[in-house]
């Protein structure tokens, strides 16, 4: 029996502020049973981003239907990204227990947040074509 692996295919993802970020994760086996959790960061201070079995995570949506019994896609979509969301996200498989036991972590996906581009609109002057290309960065 092959050992379960947790695969996060992207090392990094870049998203514009205000957009949604998709963080991909798949497991290579459904067994052993136990939930998947997403964290930002590592160690005891890591932040829980999504828990498959409980909790309220209003900005996080599973990409695949988690109620499918054969589901091995644990990718998530985080909406309305802000610069505060930047960091490295880990998809972690747990084995059932009391409490559940961490079994395997993905390699992590670094989320970087680009400032939201907005355009100047000038209606007069010879520099209009150049001004329209200037980007104002909002943090």
């Amino acid at each position: 029996e092959e050992e379960l692996q947790v695969i996060q295919p992207e090392k990094s993802v870049s998203v514009a502020a205000g957009e949604s970020a998709t963080l991909n994760c798949t497991a290579t086996s459904l067994i052993p049973v136990g939930p998947i959790q997403w964290f930002r960061g590592v160690g005891p201070g890591r932040e829980l981003i999504y828990h498959q079995k409980e909790g309220h995570f209003p900005r996080v949506t599973p990409v695949s239907d988690p109620t499918k019994r054969n589901n091995m896609d644990f990718s998530i979509r985080i909406s309305n990204i802000t610069p505060a969301d930047a960091g490295t996200y880990y998809c972690v498989k747990f084995r059932k227990g009391s409490p559940d036991v961490e079994l395997k972590s993905g390699a992590g996906t670094e989320l970087s947040v680009r400032a939201k581009p907005s355009h100047h609109h000038h209606h007069h002057g010879l520099n209009d074509i150049f001004e329209a290309q200037k980007i104002e960065w909002h943090e």
Partner: antibody, heavy 118, light 109 residues
Framework: EVQLVESGGGVVQPGGSLRLSCAAS????????MSWVRQAPGKGLEWVAG????????YYPASVKGRFTISRDNSKNTLYLQMNSLRAEDTAVYYC???????????WGQGTLVTVSS | SYELTQPPSVSVSPGQTARITCSGG??????YAWYQQKPGQAPVTLIY???KRPSNIPERFSGSSSGTTVTLTISGVQAEDEADYYC???????????FGGGTKLTVLG
């Protein structure tokens, strides 16, 4: 408050068909997988069908596969069980049940009785 | 026949502790639950995910697991606990929900 109310049971002849319904309320029906579980008179519980939240994936034990079809209408918050080629051994109380995240059952309806008899 | 095995009956005096066991599933691919059923009523979920108790269930009901055996423990048994108790599972290797045959709990006296 979670409520599951089954209907559609009755007496049917062997070889006949019946469709059961389960009206759900008190929770976000479209987010939960659902199942049907039956209990023959004086016997234990037997799971007969399951369906994912979106309705695309269905699951059955060998005892009913090919004869029973589970489906759902999320716009009506209703779960269905279409039973064809019914046999005497399908006589039972049929319960609909809401599934937990790991496909166990947390809430049950009161059941509807199906009797297959000539 | 039932895929999970539990004793057909257990008897206990009021105030004592009742233990009902269930075995037959692989630890790595199974989650277990316990359901209580009184005559003429629908089942009620007592325990899910091996040892989790819904908020509306009294604390005297608890679940535990050891290897391939799970146990329902009822502490300080009351007359109202007389019922049938079913062990149920979810088997991730077959996508099915097996049940045990049920255990009739009799409260003596």
């Amino acid at each position: 408050e979670v409520q599951l109310v089954e209907s559609g049971g009755g007496v049917v002849q062997p070889g006949g068909s019946l469709r059961l319904s389960c009206a759900a309320s008190g929770f976000t029906f479209s987010s939960n997988a659902m199942s049907w579980v039956r209990q023959a008179p004086g016997k234990g519980l037997e799971w007969v069908a399951g369906i994912s939240a979106g309705g695309s994936d269905t699951y059955y034990p060998a005892s009913v596969k090919g004869r029973f079809t589970i489906s759902r209408d999320n716009s009506k918050n209703t779960l269905y069980l279409q039973m064809n080629s019914l046999r005497a051994e399908d006589t039972a109380v049929y319960y609909c049940a809401r599934e937990t995240w790991n496909h166990l059952f947390d809430y049950w309806g009161q059941g509807t009785l199906v009797t297959v008899s000539s | 026949s039932y895929e999970l095995t539990q004793p057909p009956s257990v008897s206990v005096s009021p105030g004592q502790t009742a233990r009902i066991t269930c075995s037959g599933g692989s630890y790595s691919s199974y989650y277990y639950a316990w359901y209580q059923q009184k005559p003429g009523q629908a089942p009620v979920t007592l325990i899910y995910s091996d040892d989790k108790r819904p908020s509306n269930i009294p604390e005297r009901f608890s679940g535990s697991s050891s290897g391939t055996t799970v146990t329902l423990t009822i502490s300080g048994v009351q007359a109202e606990d007389e019922a049938d108790y079913y062990c149920g599972g979810y088997d991730q290797s077959s996508y099915t929900n097996p049940f045990g045959g049920g255990t009739k709990l009799t409260v003596l006296g």
